[in-house]
Interface confidence: medium
């Protein structure tokens, strides 16, 4: 007979768990991608922007040596949730321009949400403690003018595209470690 | 738009040195990890060298240990390559990298360094 | 001798379909990500796939990748005359701490 009804379900593989996230991780990877790349064409980019209110990148060819699995799903998920704000900030403060990019950003918030549901749950199921952000969260103020919303989405969506794809290569690497 | 554009190559004799750079523009060269990736005349592309956003770590291929050193300078946005004990096998094009994972998105279009006496 | 393992040519004729294998082991392709470039003559070499099966935007969709256990493969269907170039496998070695390149495959479209 099974577990009696109620009761708490037993973990599953963490591999498996962490295999989900990876898929997820990457899909939302070719999102961005593909997202910042429709921004590059609508809105092309003089030069590199960045905003101060974005996290710092965690990861780099000198840290995957090093990595531990409590660690990185800490992390990504405080820094992910950090982008989550700015893709809401986003949409609501972007103004008329940013408005035809709407769908999309609609729909990367949702995977976005999915996927921080879906850490939430390995971390859980991992036991380890649901961290809160280090930093105190900065309130995002309005763009100060519609340029300076496009120059917020480049930031945003370069920034989210790059914290995934050490994303993916940092659980792909700890899944080996399992 | 993302710009890698490599220079300093040339011919130099065995066991002599060079400095190759690589200047980049169009990205926030500081958030990113960069590689050199080598090309002997009519063969395959062969890894040389990795250094971290940040410049702290530096990882090289067997075949340049000792001899190379990767470095970079953030606040210029550029990548150098210090080659010294050069030899006859380390003539190529060289190309600079830039990396946001795993993978090499954009690349230089190269630079040709000669070994010859 | 390439860590990675490619045919050195394959070949098709326009509108075929072609697969480049690329085999390795558990401390490469085994435990990460596996990547393909294209390399035209005489130009630099440029992602085409990356993940396994992810590809960049305007890479056309006849590319796309593979993987399973230690070895990955590059299929390109509807094969077209500019397809003619050198492909490469890369990963990143975790015995080596470095990338490990496949030593490339001459793609002739006949």
């Known amino acids: 007979p099974g577990p009696p009804a109620g009761s708490p379900r037993v973990s599953s593989d963490p591999r498996a768990d962490l295999d989900s996230a990876v898929l997820l991780t990457r899909s939302l990877l070719a999102d961005t991608r593909q997202l910042a790349a429709q921004m590059r064409d609508k809105f092309p980019a003089d030069g590199d922007h960045s905003l101060d209110s974005l996290p710092t990148l965690a990861m780099s060819a000198g840290t995957l040596g090093s990595l531990q699995l409590p660690g990185v799903l800490t992390r990504l998920r405080v820094d992910l949730m950090s982008y989550l704000r700015h893709v809401q900030w986003l949409r609501r403060a972007g103004g008329p321009s940013l408005k035809t990019l709407e769908p999309e950003l609609g729909a990367l918030q949702a995977r976005l949400e999915r996927l921080l549901r879906r850490l939430q749950l390995l971390m859980s199921r991992l036991a380890l403690p649901q961290a809160a952000p280090d930093q105190p969260v900065i309130p995002l103020g309005p763009p100060a003018s519609a340029w300076g919303s496009i120059r917020a989405a480049h930031a945003i969506l370069g920034g989210l595209h790059l914290t995934l794809d050490w994303a993916v290569r940092g659980l792909l690497l700890l899944k080996t470690r399992l | 738009q993302v710009q890698l554009v490599e220079s300093g190559g040339g011919v130099v004799q065995p066991g002599r040195s060079l400095r190759l750079s690589c200047a980049a523009s169009g990205f926030t060269f500081s958030h990113y990890d960069m590689h050199w990736v080598r090309q002997a005349p009519g063969k395959g592309l062969e890894w040389v060298a990795v250094i971290s956003y940040e410049g702290s770590n530096k990882f090289y291929a067997d075949s340049v240990k000792g001899r190379f050193t990767i470095s970079r300078d953030n606040s210029k946005n550029t990548l150098y390559l210090q080659m010294n004990s050069l030899r006859a096998e380390d003539t190529a094009v060289y190309y600079c990298?830039?990396?946001?994972?795993?993978?090499?998105?954009?690349w230089g279009q190269g630079t040709l360094v000669t070994v010859s006496s | 001798q390439s860590v990675l393992t490619q045919p050195p040519s394959a070949s098709g004729t326009p509108g075929q379909r072609v697969t480049i294998s690329c085999s390795g082991s558990?401390?490469?392709?085994?435990?990460?990500?596996v990547n393909w470039y294209q390399q035209l003559p005489g130009t630099a070499p440029k992602l085409l796939i990356y993940y396994d099966d992810l590809r960049p935007s305007g890479v056309p969709d006849r590319f796309s990748g593979s993987k399973s256990g230690t070895s990955a493969s590059l299929a390109i269907s509807g094969l077209r005359s500019e397809d003619e170039a050198d492909y490469y496998c890369?990963?990143?070695?975790?015995?080596?701490?470095?990338?490990?390149f496949g030593g490339g495959t001459k793609l002739t479209v006949l």
């Open positions: 990298a830039r990396t946001p994972g795993s993978h090499f998105d954009y």
């Open positions: 558990s401390s490469n392709i085994g435990s990460n990500a």
């Open positions: 890369a990963a990143w070695d975790d015995s080596l701490s470095g990338v490990v």
